[in-house]
Interface confidence: medium
């Protein structure tokens, strides 16, 4: 029997082949086996299906970094990394996603949905949409909706001050955040670490915290693959 | 154009109640959250509460956290509170104001407010 | 709650001279935060939000400055119309607390 999605676009598509096991995978942009990207998938949380596109959990990555770097993404997939602006812009433009947040400190965890979720492109400066709260973290998101992302070197945020370079990291500030998950690892300095802002506060960095998207319709889907 | 209309406010007796309503035009009523905010007469402005676009979180001042409810009927296009056990206090004139983000919010567009007396 | 001091309390100036109002939050607010003008009998209007940006419509003889817990309120030129209450508030954290209003009026 042929798989069901031979390319597969994202993590819900490889989950639909039969693939239930977090980890690496390819998938194709648009279908297009020309258009190969390595993802972590994770398949466990809230159904599976998504995409891991940002992991912070020790600190060996350095996410003080330019536009080039977060354009194209860098880390190891399986560690700390970021998949890249590109990457993420053409991923949310094969159709509508959803966006999931975990966060984890010393036992305690947290996460938020939004049920729609894209990042437009190089010309629009990856603007953010985000809309649809639910979860136990808390609405900080919404603050960056329609935030164009920012690094040290493009200042794109609503400042005077270059938020990217005042707050050591590179998100989609506006004046400057709520959320800055790519921010300096275990800094608990005002705003300057990694911050949830509705969980732990400004003042608190966080251990673990991961971003990832699927299908808002994932639910769907994989209500139809469990009919086949 | 956008615009807030409060009404409901008048002449109330100490321990008594009161409900404000805030009738909103000319924007997406239910992207937005929207607050209440008051000021006494000759004073400054205080926030008094404040709600979510779904309507799902509200946020109040200590000083009407049990005794003021915040609420809305997005397909009304209307914004509410309900005071009770109304104290000389809480003599203000109430501004129904629209916020831009939600929790933490910058109040853009501002009703003419209405004026609330709580005296015997 | 995050306490917000506003100064001068009152500011008699003349039309054309450049006006300058402080507001110190009592604790670190990165940018978040508004500034209000109030005429009397009037609602309060939105002047400048986020620190710096100005809302669509104010003259830009109006211009906010500032981050962490020091902001500045600037009129470039005072105009007759300018004679207000003029009021910061922190958009932080909930309660939004304000300043307690500066009165702008004519010397």
């Known amino acids: 029997i042929g798989l069901l999605y031979p390319f597969p676009r994202d993590c819900s598509q490889a989950m639909l082949n039969g693939d239930t096991t977090s980890g690496l995978y390819t998938i194709y942009i648009n279908g297009d086996k020309t258009q190969a990207l390595e993802v972590y998938c994770d398949m466990t949380s809230d159904g599976g299906g998504w995409i891991v596109f940002l992991r912070r959990k020790n600190g060996r990555e350095d996410f003080y970094r330019n536009w080039k770097a977060y354009a194209a993404g860098f880390g190891d997939r399986r560690e700390e990394f970021w998949l890249g602006l590109d990457n993420l812009s053409k991923i949310t433009a094969q159709g509508q996603y959803e966006l999931r947040v975990d966060l984890q400190d010393h036992g305690e965890s947290a996460y938020a949905v939004y049920d729609r979720f894209s990042v437009g492109d190089a010309k629009s400066r990856y603007k953010l949409k985000v809309e649809g709260y639910s979860g136990t973290a808390g609405d900080s998101m919404n603050y960056h909706n329609g935030r164009s992302f920012s690094t040290y070197d493009k200042d794109t945020d609503s400042a005077i001050t270059n938020c990217a370079l005042s707050y050591k990291g590179a998100f989609w500030y506006k004046n400057c955040h709520r959320v800055n998950l790519m921010g300096r690892y275990g800094d608990n300095n005002h705003s300057q670490g990694v911050n949830w802002f509705h969980w732990k506060g400004h003042e608190y960095s966080i251990q673990f915290a991961e971003m990832k998207l699927r299908p808002s319709n994932f639910r769907n889907l994989e209500g139809r693959r469990k009919r086949a | 154009q956008v615009q807030l209309v409060e009404s409901g406010g008048g002449l109330v007796q100490p321990g008594r109640s009161l409900r404000l309503s805030c009738a909103a035009s000319?924007?997406?009523?239910?992207?937005?959250?929207m607050h209440w905010v008051r000021q006494a007469p000759g004073k400054g402005l205080e926030w008094v509460s404040g709600i979510s676009g779904s309507g799902g979180s509200t946020y109040y001042a200590d000083s009407v956290k049990g005794r003021f409810t915040i609420s809305r009927d997005n397909a009304k296009n209307s914004l509410y509170l309900q005071m009770n056990s109304l104290r000389a206090e809480d003599t203000a004139l109430y501004y129904c104001a629209k916020g831009t983000r939600g929790e933490g919010d910058t109040f853009d567009i501002w009703g003419q407010g209405t004026m609330v007396t709580v005296s015997s | 709650d995050i306490q917000m001091t506003q100064s001068p309390a009152s500011l008699p100036t003349p039309v054309g001279d450049r006006v300058t109002i402080t507001c110190r939050a009592s604790?670190?607010?990165?940018?978040?935060l508004n500034w209000y003008q109030q005429k009397p009998g009037k609602a309060p209007k939105l002047l400048i939000y986020d620190a710096s940006n100005l809302e669509t419509g104010v003259p830009s003889r109006f211009s906010g400055s500032g981050s962490g817990t020091d902001f500045t309120l600037t009129i470039s030129s005072l105009q007759p119309e300018d004679f207000a209450t003029y009021y910061c508030q922190q958009s932080y954290s909930t309660p939004q607390t304000f300043g307690q209003g500066t009165k702008v009026d004519i010397k």
């Open positions: 604790q670190y607010i990165q940018g978040f």
């Open positions: 000319g924007f997406t009523f239910d992207d937005y959250a």
